[in-house]
Interface confidence: medium
């Protein structure tokens, strides 16, 4: 496997008081293979609220690379292929659990972390505020 | 703490051969506060590809309950509020990490698992296959 420079301050994995710590097997089981999901590969281009994917990399995190969606337009694409600003493209956000090395560079010690990522975009009717 | 019936086959957390096992601090750190996220609260109703949330429960998994998006229509909602079948509502899927008790009923032994969840729906132009 990968050799990670070890931080001398790494916690003792046998320390019974290591806070709220459990043993986690990182041979990640992927439940998705049975369902044979059709990856939403080209939806980002075909959507009426298209998006671009941006790479976010952090070597101290697992997974190290996360792709983030950014909506291409404020409005949505209409039947003529033009942007209709009477509608809004908005990101669909989702929290994901990631593992962060803690302390940094410790090969066998992690903390679970929640981060918010934008997965894709959807087209919504705007909320119109009427001024009295 | 909680009294959990313990499986006698639980792995020894000090077993050096326990496969690819790491210590994980489950005090989940929330990185989302800095970005001040606005929850995409009502997008599921306001979207031109609206969706419902369905409950999926598994007591051996954390989080035990996952709410999955299911697109309400095959088509998308047009400006008149009707379903336009010339467009398609499709689910945006994302892999998330969950923890599974392994073996079951062991209080401090888990396996990371990747599952594919539908987060919401987007409206796409259909792929039309022309038959010669």
């Amino acid at each position: 496997g990968i050799t990670i420079p070890r931080n001398p301050g790494c916690p003792n994995s046998e320390d019974k008081n290591f806070p709220r710590t459990v043993m986690v097997n990182l041979n990640i089981h992927n439940r998705n293979t049975n369902t044979n999901p059709k990856r939403s590969s080209d939806y980002y281009n075909r959507s009426t609220s298209p998006w671009n994917l941006h790479r976010n990399e952090d070597p101290e995190r697992y997974p190290s690379v996360i792709w983030e969606a950014k909506c291409r337009h404020l409005g949505c694409i209409n039947a003529d292929g033009n942007v209709d600003y009477h509608m809004n493209s908005v990101p669909i956000q989702q929290e994901i659990l990631v593992l962060r090395r803690e302390p940094p560079h410790c090969p066998n010690s992690f903390r679970l972390e929640k981060i918010l990522v934008s997965v894709g975009c959807t087209c919504v009717t705007p909320i119109v505020h009427h001024v009295a | 703490g909680i009294t959990i019936p313990r499986n006698p086959g639980c792995p020894n957390s000090e077993d050096k051969n326990f496969p690819r096992t790491v210590m994980v601090n489950l005090n989940i750190h929330n990185r989302n506060t800095n970005t001040n996220p606005k929850r995409s609260s009502d997008y599921y109703n306001r979207s031109t590809s609206p969706w419902n949330l369905h409950r999926n429960e598994d007591p051996e998994r954390y989080p035990s309950v996952i709410w999955e998006a299911k697109c309400r229509h095959l088509g998308c909602i047009n400006a008149d509020g009707n379903v336009d079948y010339h467009m398609n509502s499709v689910p945006i899927q994302q892999e998330i990490l969950v923890l599974r008790r392994e073996p079951p009923h062991c209080p401090n032994s888990f396996r990371l698992e990747k599952i594919l969840v539908s987060v919401g729906c987007t409206c796409v132009t259909p792929i039309v296959h022309h038959v010669a």
Epitope: Q93, Q94 | R39, S41, L53, P59, S64
Partner: antibody, heavy 126, light 107 residues
Framework: EVQLVQSGAEVKKPGESLKVSCKAS????????ISWVRQAPGQGLEWMGG????????DYAQKFQGRVTITADESTTTAYMELSGLTSDDTAVYYC???????????????????WGQGTTVTVSS | EIVLTQSPDFQSVAPKEKVTITCRAS??????LHWYQQKPDQSPKLLIK???HSVSGVPSRFSGSGSGTDFTLTINGLEAEDAGTYYC?????????FGQGTKVDIK
Amino acid sequence: EVQLVQSGAEVKKPGESLKVSCKASGGRFRTYGISWVRQAPGQGLEWMGGITNFFGWTDYAQKFQGRVTITADESTTTAYMELSGLTSDDTAVYYCAREPNEFWNGYYTTHDFDSWGQGTTVTVSS
Amino acid sequence: EIVLTQSPDFQSVAPKEKVTITCRASQNIGSELHWYQQKPDQSPKLLIKYASHSVSGVPSRFSGSGSGTDFTLTINGLEAEDAGTYYCHQSISLPYTFGQGTKVDIK
């Protein structure tokens, strides 16, 4: 829907201990946590602590640290709150509340209290 | 700890009128704010979760808005059964805290 039924009213003397139970029914016990919230007469709500049933974790408000113990028994789907060293300031209604652990609308774990017990009135008086 | 301050402390409102209760957090809490209703001699009841999400079984006249530090609970068209005390609650960090409560009575 989850229902939480608490033990009955108690009258205690200063210095004594209190143990309140909260029996859950109508849902998988492991899929949520139980928090304890108290309300002194005419006052607002005060969170004391809680337990995450899936992991067996407990969290306590610093004010009650060392004096409160929250436990749960999965086999009987019952949570308990024990408070020691009672004083007259502990006179209150004690509530248990369900805290779901869910991945909902794109977010991990919801920490709202979506179901409450009926409350247990505790009077501490010499 | 995060302090939640509600205003007003008390409100007397006529039926069918609009009620607005605000909750201010001492620091940014994103949208981790929930609203509860407590009627006299009853347990609290969840009304709105995560600032603006409606809860099953709660009348649509109850709505919530806001994020960051400023939040609002609105009752559009007060009904007699809405009399009680309303609390906000933050769940972004421990210890969980509640606002001091806003008592609403019917004129």
